[in-house]
Interface confidence: medium
């Protein structure tokens, strides 16, 4: 706001105001009158930009005027008072009371004074995001979804992620005549790394305080990934039972395992238990290639592991693996 | 073709009263300053008062409170100027005028061809 | 009520520059004051000249120019001509009222 005068009146308001869309606002505008000087205040008037004849007038002794009656009140001014405080509250803010409005005082004997007060109609957005359930595709498809929703002006979405990937934002008219929907796709090539990961949206509005953050966790739907441990290369004769185990990773959980071996069904010392093939001890050395074969909804994969039994005393007598 | 056209020359005895009008054209009548001024032969100008058209609201130099009433009738435009009590004092010429803005300030802007009046016995 | 001084007279040639001004019996001449000047010609023709101590009235030549000069308001005719021969008044606001001054008459000699 301009600094008080020293000798001449003055004219104080905002050069901004913000309001809501359906919502009321003051337009605030002060005469400031300094020291002892006098002025007669004998009018105030309202009016917008590119527009004939004024939205709101007070007269000093006919009172207020409306284009508008239901929209528009003095907020202060009242018949039998000075009139130094013209500020105007307007009701049910539209999106075409955007604009720029012109106060203005006419005082005598020092002239109109008036100032200039751009009037910002906002909307706030509401925010969502959600994941978008994908399967390995070999090329980029959107992963997560950002959508805010009947903003003005439209909100701004950016993303952070660790994964790589790429945003596609589009804008469409919003359910309320003026203000806009912003949808911000996630895009990447999905794998099955990315799966339970996380990338984060970000609005931002001149209707929020700060911006607001919506994390989305991922999912990508892929096959099992498998492979089998527990063995060391040092499993010996008259050891203790030992355990393989099945490791898979898979989007959805497996829904089953099954285990044999290249030669075909699994040999007595060797017992399945889910994902695990339980090696009873052995008499003689083996060398057999064990296969678990796991399955999910979308498919089946399968590893290979080579186990051998050999002769010679166990380093440890704890058992045919270190577990 | 903004114009201030004032009532013609009054020849009033003492202790009367007079009423002078200044009809105006050309111009947005309720939202104007209309000041009265008096200029004695010879002499300087004096202000009296003025009134805002659009309101009727008036303000008076405190000489002539009581002496002098300033109203307007915004139907047809004119401003009127009531002098009462009258003395030969009061003999003079009588102008309205116009305020004009230049936006930052007032000034005299448009004036009437002003009305003599004679006060005599 | 204040007493608004002006020069009685003031003589010019044309082309000249000549500085009319008005004294306030209160004190100095501020913006507060709202400096009018008015002129008159022959058979009561009265012309608003400035307003607002500077504001030079539309229509008014650019040789017309109102401004504080130490304690008082002057209107300034820079390059005076043959038809700016008239009486000038000054008229000074004081919170509610004006007064003017008693009038200046200027003469611009051939």
């Known amino acids: 706001w301009p600094p008080p005068g020293t000798g001449d009146i003055i004219v104080q308001a905002p050069t901004q105001v913000p309001g809501f869309l359906g919502d009321s606002v003051t337009l605030p505008c002060y005469l400031q009158v300094p020291g002892m000087e006098e002025t007669h205040v004998s009018q105030l008037t309202w009016s917008r930009h590119g527009e004939s004849g004024s939205m709101a007038v007070f007269h000093q002794t006919q009172g207020p005027n409306y284009s508008e009656p239901k929209r528009l009140e003095f907020v202060a001014a009242r018949l039998g008072t000075e009139l130094r405080d013209a500020s105007l509250r307007m009701f049910g803010l539209r999106v075409e009371d955007e604009g720029n409005y012109t106060c203005l005082f006419v005082t005598f004997p020092q002239g109109s004074r008036s100032v200039d007060i751009w009037l910002r109609v906002l909307a706030k957005p509401q925010n969502t995001a959600e994941v978008q359930k994908v399967q390995l595709t070999g090329k980029p498809v959107p992963v997560a979804r950002c959508v805010s929703t009947g903003g003005r002006p439209p909100a701004h979405i950016t993303w952070h992620s660790d994964l790589g990937g790429m945003p596609n934002t589009s804008q469409a008219p919003g359910f309320l005549s003026g203000t806009v929907t912003v949808t911000s796709l996630w895009i990447l090539v999905p794998s099955s790394q990315v799966d339970g990961k996380s990338v984060t949206c970000k609005v931002e509005h001149e209707s929020f305080e700060k911006p607001q953050l919506l994390t989305v966790n991922l999912t990508v739907y892929y096959p099992p990934e498998v492979s089998i441990s527990g063995y060391d290369n040092n499993w010996y004769l008259s050891q203790n039972e030992a355990t393989l185990t099945c490791d898979a990773r898979s989007n959805p959980e497996p829904t089953g395992y099954n285990w044999s071996t290249t030669m075909g069904p699994l040999p007595p010392f060797a017992v399945a238990q889910g994902a695990q093939l339980l090696i009873r001890p052995v008499d003689k050395p083996i060398n057999t290639t064990f296969i678990c074969n796991v399955t999910n909804a979308l498919g089946a994969r399968q590893a290979e592991l080579t186990v051998q039994v050999k002769e010679g005393p166990p380093s440890e007598p704890s058992g045919m693996s270190s577990n | 073709q903004v114009q201030m056209q004032q009532s013609g020359a009054e020849l009033v005895k003492p202790g009367a009263s007079v009423k002078l009008s200044c009809k105006t054209s050309?111009?947005?009548?309720?939202?104007?300053?209309i000041s009265w001024l008096k200029q004695k032969p010879g002499q300087s100008l004096e202000w009296i008062a003025w009134i805002y058209a659009g309101t009727g609201d008036t303000n008076y130099n405190q000489k002539f409170t009581g002496k002098a009433q300033v109203t307007v009738d915004t139907s047809s435009s004119t401003a009127y100027m009531q002098f009462s009590s009258l003395t030969t004092e009061d003999s003079a010429i009588y102008y309205c005028v116009r305020h004009g803005s230049t936006g930052r300030g007032w000034y005299f802007a448009v004036w009437g061809a002003g009305t003599t009046v004679t006060v005599s016995s | 009520q204040a007493v608004v001084t002006q020069e009685s007279a003031l003589t010019t040639s044309p082309g000249e520059t000549v500085t009319l001004t008005c004294r306030s019996s209160t004190g100095a001449v501020t913006t507060s004051n709202y400096a009018n000047w008015v002129q008159e010609k022959p058979d009561h023709l009265f012309t608003g000249l400035i307003g607002g101590t500077n504001n030079r009235a539309p229509g008014v030549p650019a040789r017309f120019s109102g401004s504080l000069i130490g304690d008082k308001a002057a209107l300034t005719i820079t390059g005076a001509q043959t038809e700016d021969e008239a009486i000038y008044f000054c008229?000074?606001?004081?919170?509610?009222?004006?007064?003017f001054g008693g009038g200046t008459k200027l003469t611009v000699l051939q």
């Open positions: 008229a000074l606001w004081y919170s509610n009222h004006f007064v």
């Open positions: 050309g111009f947005t009548f309720s939202s104007s300053y």
